[in-house]
């Protein structure tokens, strides 16, 4: 705690050339009495830019009328700026002294240079698709900024994530910079809507980040869940079953019946249903002439979902007299046997 | 908090050299000057000068030949001597916190007698 | 040396009617859009304590009773209304030149 302090908020100004430069100072006393002068650079060779006592600045403007009652807003305005005015530049908070000012204190300086925009991040996704819970790799890049600072954050759905790294290059002084990131991110069932945002702030777009987006229907993969259901009897001797196909995406898949083996029919899904997380949904039926077999029937619904290995339900049928109406399927895994016996 | 507190002899003889201390808390003289402001018995406040946090000093000219403010950072201690007294110089002696002078402390009653 | 005059040198008031006190400095005291003149209030036996600073503004706790206005050479501070605890000397001060310069003071008597 200091009895007067010199406060200048921005560390760096950013300005491209022929436009204005704003440099902010504010003090947090009036006390002791005395005038506020702007240096550039610091030390015996520090260059004058403006003084509140006294002197001509033709390119220097304050942003507060400084014959205001107790004004206490020291900031100014250069104009025209030019490459050659880059530089540290200093508030310094001058006391009455007998006989010359003397120097009291200084704020902590701004840094002013020619500003160059950083370019539109691009996020890249992994390049093979993933299942949920999964956790997958994003990166963005952004390049040509200057100067250094600059702030990256990752959303997901418009939360913000914790789990990346970062990176800015070079680490020295250079005229522009570039900027990596990678974030992970868990995949859900529920994220083939979701969108990973990677936000970059800096100085140069007054307060409006730049975006880069990427949709993770172009990296989730939701494997189906099927479940193989006996219907109601169409004939005395036909049996009607069904492979419900559920919550897959993307929508590339096919589906193969085989009745104890032997491939019956394959189909591509065509008409699909959508839900709202933006998975699908699709079923396929299969008509089993019941005496034409002699045996028990093993009905398989067998589906090639996004060019993974198979996943298949099977289904049981015993062959006897009469056939009746059954009950449903519910197991959830993969594979599995499940007995439905006609009388 | 803020706290200022004033000491030293209370009876000095003419021609001597007065010495007081002024020890303070709850704030850095580095930060802060320090004044030294007198008062006379029944009458009105005179500043006598001040020692800024950085170590500069400004002094009321009609008393600066024979004044020195100096301080010890270390102690939080601001010392004032007035040399060569004469009655005159009796007073209340404050110390009082930066060029606002915001806080004050209780003051010490200095007499000069022989 | 800026001398600081102050009046009335003494005044006596009643409980809740409004005292007035005026300093006028010998040169002006504004700098830099502000006006370096400071109020202060003593009781006996107490160091002064701080009521205004820079012409019109109140210290932290002092109560909205106690106002300061003015500008280069004439001030006034105001109390409205009066309090019985209000009985003191009240001191103007400067610190605009050097020699930082107190006015001699004005004794406030409540009837």
């Known amino acids: 705690e200091e009895e007067l302090q010199v406060i200048q908020p921005d560390k760096s100004v950013l300005v491209a050339a022929g436009e204005t430069a704003t440099l902010r100072c504010t003090a947090t006393s009036l006390i002791p009495v005395g005038p506020i002068q702007w240096f550039r650079g610091a030390g015996p060779g520090r260059e004058l830019i403006y003084n509140q006592k006294e002197g001509h600045f033709p390119r220097v403007t304050t942003v507060s009328d400084l014959t205001k009652r107790n004004n206490m807003d020291f900031s100014i305005r250069i104009g025209n700026i030019t490459p050659a005015d880059a530089g540290t530049y200093y508030c310094v908070k001058f006391r009455k002294g007998s006989p010359d000012d003397v120097e009291f204190k200084s704020g902590a300086g701004t840094e002013l240079s020619v500003r160059a925009k950083p370019s539109a991040p691009v996020v890249s996704g992994p390049a093979a698709r993933a299942t949920p819970q999964h956790t997958v790799s994003f990166t963005c890049e952004s390049h040509g900024f200057s100067p250094r600072d600059i702030t990256l954050k990752w959303f997901k759905n418009g939360n913000e994530l914790s789990d990346f790294q970062t990176n800015v290059d070079p680490v020295g002084e250079s005229v522009s910079y570039s900027i990596h990131s990678t974030a992970k991110v868990v995949l859900t069932r529920e994220d083939v809507h979701s969108q990973v945002i990677c936000e970059v702030a800096h100085v140069t777009l007054q307060g409006d980040p730049l975006r880069g987006t990427a949709n993770l229907s172009e990296t989730i993969r939701v494997p189906p869940t099927l479940e193989v259901t006996q219907q109601p009897v169409r004939a005395e001797n036909q049996v009607n079953v069904t492979c419900q196909v559920r919550k897959f995406y993307p929508q590339r898949l096919q589906l193969t019946w085989l009745e104890n083996g032997n491939v019956s029919r394959t189909e591509t899904a065509s008409t699909v249903t959508e839900n709202k997380d933006g998975t699908y949904n699709w079923m396929s039926w299969l008509l089993v002439n019941v005496s034409a077999h002699r045996d028990d029937v093993k009905l398989t619904c067998q589906v090639e979902h996004d060019g993974q290995p198979a996943v298949s339900k099977s289904h049981d049928l015993k062959v006897s007299a009469h056939p009746k109406e059954q009950g449903s399927n519910t197991a959830a895994e993969n594979t599995g046997s499940n007995e439905r016996n006609i009388y | 908090q803020v706290q200022l507190q004033e000491s030293g002899p209370g009876l000095v003889k003419p021609s001597q050299t007065l010495s007081l201390t002024c020890t303070v808390s709850?704030?850095?003289?580095?930060?802060?000057?320090v004044n030294w402001i007198r008062q006379p018995p029944g009458k009105g406040l005179e500043w006598i000068g001040i020692?800024?946090?950085?170590?500069?000093?400004d002094y009321n000219s009609a008393l600066k030949s024979r004044v020195t403010i100096s301080k010890d950072t270390s102690k939080n201690q601001v010392f004032l001597k007035l040399s060569s007294v004469t009655a005159a110089d009796t007073a209340v002696y404050y110390c009082?916190?930066?060029?606002?002078?915001?806080?004050w402390g209780q003051g010490t009653t200095v007499t000069v007698s022989s | 040396d800026i001398v600081l005059t102050q009046s009335p040198a003494s005044l006596a008031v009643s409980p809740g009617q409004r005292a007035t006190i005026t300093c006028r400095a010998s040169?002006?005291?504004?700098?830099?859009?502000?006006?370096?003149m400071h109020w202060y209030q003593q009781k006996p036996g107490q160091p002064p304590k701080p009521l205004i600073y820079?012409?019109?503004n109140l210290e932290s706790g002092v109560p909205a009773r106690f106002s300061g206005s003015g500008s280069g050479t004439d001030f006034t501070l105001t109390i409205n209304p009066v309090e019985a605890n209000d009985a003191a000397n009240y001191y103007c001060?400067?610190?605009?030149?050097?020699?930082?310069?107190f006015g001699g003071g004005t004794k406030v008597e409540i009837k």
């Open positions: 009082a916190r930066a060029g606002k002078m915001d806080y």
């Open positions: 709850g704030f850095s003289l580095t930060g802060y000057g």
């Open positions: 020692i800024w946090g950085d170590g500069s000093t």
């Open positions: 040169e002006s005291v504004d700098s830099y859009g502000s006006s370096f």
């Open positions: 820079l012409a019109s």
């Open positions: 001060q400067q610190n605009n030149e050097y020699p930082w310069t």
